[in-house]
């Protein structure tokens, strides 16, 4: 089987959503957990994570081969405390398989803005913290 994990971010007003998306086959879901860690380069686990989610066992319909499961971690207002390195991971409690997404970072600047970097190649998001706009 092939399980794919991606990281993304979206902004709604002053809120920042950090999103871990896992694509997987129905039969691969059992025992799988997706989780988001901060500043945990070596020991990212569900126990040390900011948030965790069991993968969907059922896509809700039968005419699909793959299921998308999405973990969303919402920061209502980004502060300097949120600066750091984040990583989406997944682990099977059944088979021991472990997946690690790319590291991405939130950098809070002195001007009160913040940037999110490393989500995808060539993708660099810069958010204005005060005005809540994508610049």
């Amino acid at each position: 089987g092939c399980i794919n994990i991606t990281s993304s971010a979206s902004q709604e007003g002053t809120r920042l959503n950090l999103i871990c998306t896992v694509w997987h086959k129905k039969e691969e879901a059992e025992g799988f957990v997706v989780f988001l860690c901060k500043d945990r380069s070596g020991d990212c686990s569900p126990e040390t994570s900011l948030k965790q989610l069991r993968l969907k066992r059922d896509p809700g319909i039968d005419g699909v081969g793959e299921i998308s499961s999405q973990l969303m971690f919402t920061i209502s207002q980004v502060t300097p405390l949120h600066s750091g390195t984040y990583q989406c991971c997944a682990r099977s409690q059944k088979s021991g398989i472990r997946l690690q997404g790319h590291f991405f970072s939130i950098l809070f600047t002195e001007t009160g803005n913040y940037t999110v970097t490393g989500l995808k190649q060539r993708q660099h998001l810069e958010f204005s913290h005060n005005e809540g706009t994508l610049s």
Epitope: L53, R57, G60, I61
Partner: antibody, heavy 121, light 107 residues
Framework: QVQLVQSGAEVKKPGASVKVSCKAS????????MQWIRQAPGQGLEWIGA????????QYTQKFRGRATLTADKSTSTAYMELSSLRSEDTAVYYC??????????????WGQGTTLTVSS | EIVLTQSPATLSLSPGERATLSCRAS??????LHWYQQKPGQAPRLLIK???QSISGIPARFSGSGSGTDFTLTISSLEPEDFAVYFC?????????FGGGTKVEIK
């Protein structure tokens, strides 16, 4: 044993909103899609939408998108269906139903007893 | 969306007779079709899953067949308690949809 218990009958005026609850017991609430279906007097079954409590993924039929809101509270194993801007045509029995696990059951194997909504001025 | 068309709308039969109900999908849905029975004042009850698979507790006189776009629910010998409305439902794609129903009434 699996049980779905819905809230009681409601009488609402046109333009108002209603929130129907469906309390689940006897299974792992987060692992199964909860469906919402309605049936107008003397009519067939109409699917409104479904929610997966594990990650709050919700799907709606086009007709109800923007007017129906499905939510789920994992701490109480309760699903909710809120319908806004009510009109007389919304008078119906509203059911919650659990979809059995894909490829094993797939159909709606357990149903609530139904909640009667009457919209009248 | 996938439209399910049930026929006939009403079936008038006597106890002991064989009932054949049809459900046609507007596009291929493999075997992703389920059948329900509903009696007045009651919630529907799942009879057949995935076109032809039996459900525990449902009498053996109920059987289903078909794949793709054409499906059939057969009641081999009608019992008095079988007079009800029957619905088909597809789980192939969003939005999920029901057929309009077939009422099986006593002749």
């Amino acid at each position: 044993q699996v049980q779905l218990v819905q809230s009681g009958a409601e009488v609402k005026k046109p333009g108002a909103s209603v929130k129907v609850s469906c309390k689940a017991s006897g299974y792992t609430f987060a692992d199964y899609w909860m469906q919402w279906i309605r049936q107008a007097p003397g009519q067939g079954l109409e699917w409104i939408g479904a929610i997966y409590p594990g990650d709050d993924d919700a799907q709606y039929t086009q007709k109800f998108r923007g007017r129906a809101t499905l939510t789920a509270d994992k701490s109480t194993s309760t699903a909710y269906m809120e319908l806004s801007s009510l009109r007389s045509e919304d008078t119906a029995v509203y059911y919650c139903a659990r979809r059995g696990i894909a490829a094993v059951v797939g159909g709606f194997d357990y149903w609530g007893q139904g909640t009667t909504l009457t919209v009248s001025s | 969306e996938i439209v399910l068309t049930q026929s006939p709308a009403t079936l008038s039969l006597s106890p002991g007779e064989r009932a054949t109900l049809s459900c046609r999908a507007s596009q291929s849905i493999s075997n992703h079709l389920h059948w329900y029975q509903q009696k007045p004042g009651q919630a529907p009850r799942l009879l057949i899953k995935y076109a032809s698979q039996s459900i525990s507790g449902i009498p053996a006189r109920f059987s289903g067949s078909g794949s793709g776009t054409d499906f059939t629910l057969t009641i081999s010998s009608l019992e008095p308690e079988d007079f009800a409305v029957y619905f088909c439902q597809q789980s192939n794609s969003w939005p999920l949809t029901f057929g309009g129903g077939t009422k099986v009434e006593i002749k």
